[in-house]
């Protein structure tokens, strides 16, 4: 009877830039599956006593669990499962309809370090690479998961990647986002957003690395063939990416309707909720389907733009078709046209 207490149980935490937090995926006989938070008879809003997931954190070589429950935003892979029986049991699971699944999130503390803290490889005086190459995305302090400056490590050598705007590297960016378990490439980040500017209070492991890489093959399919080592450059851009798996996503809610499944759309970025203003990039129902799904309602019945006769009506604006693609919301300080959405109510 397979459970997360079994020695041969395999799990991983995805959609984050650390192996110690993210959305829980488990390996069953036919591959990796995302675990729905509605498993084991739980509601998709219920938080659990995290200590029950101690074995998962242990297996990932992380510290003890801090929180366990619904992940705020679900990225649904091809396969998601709902499991039954005791919490943590995977012997009786069924495939879930992706739009009904809210993924299970787990955060483990970082492992206790017994040696002096450093998350960087030692300086370049050590022997040439032997460990497998790996990538890391360094977000600015308080920045987003799956967004930041790309660092490449090959054995003991690590550094940023020099990038010229004219480089035609779309395939490479997709490959890198994918390798980081961050979905697909959305856009390049200016270094201010990516957090390259050094904060004097930043921990020493975020100081600039001693070497730099240059793109060698933008169609590479394994990391060791993508980059070559160069002398660090004082100026010039470094590769900084925003991938589709970025976190946190914009949250939405419906207010002022007769149920939670209808109302004017409001969004939150940070602490404040504000009206979402209509935008020409969202004239299809795709945006509203996503909003309905986040409310755990059915598909869109209707949506209508409310008149913005009031020059003082303010709100937030997303320039993309879907809110999940919006890595930043823009303020609109006048003539904000609100949108009233009605979704199918699963519990009328």
């Amino acid at each position: 009877r397979l459970s997360w207490y079994d020695p041969d149980f395999q799990a991983r935490l995805t959609r984050s830039n650390s192996k110690c937090q993210g959305q829980l995926e488990v390996y069953l006989k036919d591959g990796w599956h995302m675990v729905c938070s509605q498993s084991w008879g739980r509601s998709s809003k219920q938080w659990e006593d995290p200590s029950q997931a101690s074995k998962v954190c242990q297996r990932l070589n992380c510290g003890v669990p801090l929180s366990l429950g619904p992940f705020l935003v679900t990225y649904t892979p091809q396969s998601s499962i709902i499991c039954y029986g005791q919490l943590g049991s995977f012997s009786n699971c069924s495939h879930s309809r992706n739009d009904m699944c809210h993924s299970l999130g787990l955060t483990c503390l970082e492992p206790q370090k017994t040696t002096p803290p450093t998350t960087r490889p030692p300086p370049t005086t050590t022997p040439e690479p032997t460990a497998p190459p790996r990538l890391q995305l360094v977000a600015q302090s308080g920045g987003q998961h799956c967004a930041g400056v790309v660092e490449f490590y090959s054995g003991s050598l690590g550094g940023t990647i020099s990038y010229e705007a004219q480089d035609k590297t779309q395939d490479l960016e997709n490959f890198l986002c994918n390798n980081l378990q961050c979905g697909s490439f959305l856009k390049h980040l200016p270094e201010t957003e990516a957090g390259r500017a050094q904060d004097p209070g930043e921990p020493r492991e975020h100081q600039p690395l001693p070497i730099q890489w240059k793109i060698q093959n933008s169609s590479c399919t394994s990391l060791e063939h993508c980059f070559r080592k160069i002398k660090p450059q004082k100026s010039g851009r470094v590769l900084a990416l925003l991938c589709s798996g970025f976190q946190p996503k914009v949250q939405s809610r419906l207010v002022g309707g007769s149920s939670i499944c209808e109302g004017t759309v409001e969004v939150r970025q940070g602490a404040q909720w504000a009206a979402l203003c209509d935008s020409s990039s969202a004239r299809s129902s795709l945006r509203w389907e996503e909003v309905c799904r986040e409310q755990q309602c059915g598909s869109v019945n209707s949506y209508r733009v409310l008149d913005a006769g009031d020059p003082t009506s303010r709100g937030l604006f997303c320039p993309h078709q879907k809110l999940s693609q919006c890595h930043e919301l823009w303020e609109r300080n006048s003539y904000c046209k609100k949108v009233f959405v009605t979704c199918q109510d699963p519990n009328p």
Epitope: P50, S51, V64, L109
Partner: nanobody, 125 residues
Framework: QVQLVESGGGLVQPGGSLRLSCVAS????????MGWFRQAPGKEREFVAV????????QYADSVKDRFTISRENAKNTVYLQMNTLKLEDTAVYYC??????????????????WGQGTQVTVSS
């Protein structure tokens, strides 16, 4: 709805000590991780420390490691931050936090649902 109330802030000289307390009400205290963030004037909120619900696990910012200790007393619904060898740069408003969103990074301010009002700590000679 969880309420968090901090106390214990004050004025202290460099090298001195302070102990902050945070009392929680309105939730299942022993299930929730609890933590501390701080915000110095003109700076972003910065992670200080966190402790798991059972108290068995802790994590600290590098800047406070070996000087600050987080602990909790579940019977009293209270979490503490013992701050030793205080430095000028520890001056900030200290906030107690709870309700960590599963799957989010520990050090992110927006990963915590509940925040106290804050208590001022000033280190000055």
């Amino acid at each position: 709805q969880v309420q968090l109330v901090e106390s214990g802030g004050g004025l202290v000289q460099p090298g001195g000590s302070l102990r902050l307390s945070c009392v929680a009400s309105g939730g299942t205290f022993s299930t929730y991780g609890m933590g501390w963030f701080r915000q110095a004037p003109g700076k972003e909120r910065e992670f200080v420390a966190v402790i798991t619900g059972s108290g068995v696990g802790t994590q600290y910012a590098d800047s406070v490691k070996d000087r600050f200790t987080i602990s909790r007393e579940n019977a009293k619904n209270t979490v503490y931050l013992q701050m030793n060898t205080l430095k000028l740069e520890d001056t900030a408003v200290y906030y107690c936090v709870s309700g960590h969103r599963p799957g989010w990074a520990v050090i992110r301010a927006d990963a915590y649902e509940y925040w106290g009002q804050g208590t001022q700590v000033t280190v000055s000679s």
